[in-house]
Interface confidence: medium
Amino acid sequence: DGCKDIFMKNEILSASQPFAFNCTFPPITSGEVSVTWYKNSSKIPVSKIIQSRIHQDETWILFLPMEWGDSGVYQCVIKGRDSCHRIHVNLTVFEKHWCDTSIGGLPNLSDEYKQILHLGKDDSLTCHLHFPKSCVLGPIKWYKDCNEIKGERFTVLETRLLVSNVSAEDRGNYACQAILTHSGKQYEVLNGITVSITERAGYGGSVPKIIYPKNHSIEVQLGTTLIVDCNVTDTKDNTNLRCWRVNNTLVDDYYDESKRIREGVETHVSFREHNLYTVNITFLEVKMEDYGLPFMCHAGVSTAYIILQLPAPDFRAY
């Protein structure tokens, strides 16, 4: 069918509550495109009827609520004027009763479910609630070990729980709860978060900022040499590592035999409050297999990618 396959996401989800996933892939969805969701390679698209328990809402797939049998691979097909991409999203649904057992035994939990507070600092936890505009979320309540959190050290601010003067006792199992309203019906969303405490000194919860790349595509001719910088700003005392990965593997390891694609030596420039780091990736010779593959720059928890694409043919020469 001419669609390029992109294997993107593995999501582990809780049954009996709403879930939504937005089909975005910035190099593709930034222009005029149509998005259609399918389940398990079915030829029949997911319904767009808002009364359906599972339906497509603009670029989102929405489960109201998610059920145990919804596990599987979902595809969203993004069709542009001259392109077609199929993004595969693997959803695993589990029965979870947050107050019964620890979340800790679950495999491959995303960072949304594992968060860190910095000892002795004022810090915060974030309740990740990703839903389309048609869903209205009520105020968030926070729980620790199944008891609603109260006390002057804790403040709820929008989607965050602010924790002042973090102590070792603040580690443990948290949950944030909100009521979601859609088409007049109400659903409960409950996200469990495992919180660990770190004593790392420095700026509380500092997140590196990737200045470049910006999740975009680069036109490059087959066979050429290409060097791309990853520019990252971070606090002066950071302990974050910066690297290039492909298919979740360090490029130097992934291309260990051919050494055709290599990561460069990191350099940095010091500024008043931060450092600017640069680490490049060198393609000695761009090959067909490189096109359409996200090459990811990682800096701590931050990521950004480039995707190589063939230049559009230039007919002016003919």
Epitope: D122, Y203, K209, T233, D234, R272, H274
Partner: antibody, heavy 127, light 107 residues
Amino acid sequence: EVQLVESGGGLVKPGGSLRLSCAASGFAFTDYYMNWVRQAPGKGLEWVALIRNKAAGYTIYYSAPVKGRFTISRDDSKSTLYLQMNSLKTEDTAVYYCVRDMTIYDGYYVDYALDYWGQGTLVTVSS
Amino acid sequence: DIVMTQSPSSVSASVGDRVTITCRASQNINIWLSWYQQKPGKAPKLFIYKASNLHTGVPSRFSGSGSGTDFTLTISSLQPEDFATYYCLQSQSYPLTFGQGTKLEIK
């Protein structure tokens, strides 16, 4: 709306002391670095001192002419910035401005610049 | 300390003129330069930060450029409200240092 209101200026003799205050409102004071900048009558602007936010350890920097004599501090619970000025000299005569720094460090640096200024308070050191 | 040198120290111009003010740093400050406008008896206002970014509410006739040691503030078509004193500030390193100012006067 961001507002910075200075107070505490006035006439003081050389060698004397004065404490300036700056009441901040309209923004999350806790998040921001804060500065004092002064301007002698008919002269240009001179940066005096900066205090970082709690996340950055409340680190302090001073300009050479005031180091050892002036103390910058902040009370986040009151959203107030202070400048304690001791051993005042005639050359300290100036309008003192309380200034918010764009640098936040809420996860990463924000562009360095002095984005909001108070109306200023006049300090006159004269015998 | 980084020394900031502004030129000219004053300039006379007419409404509609294009005016350029320059600021030179004694060492590389990358793009950590901002420009401020001050009118008599008033507090300065941030106009441009990070060398070329217009602050909220600043008219598009103002623009900034430069990096390293040489920077310019340009007003493409002077308006009556633009007559004021302009200062540059480096925030690459402590102590923060201002230029001595450029007074823009009506010709």
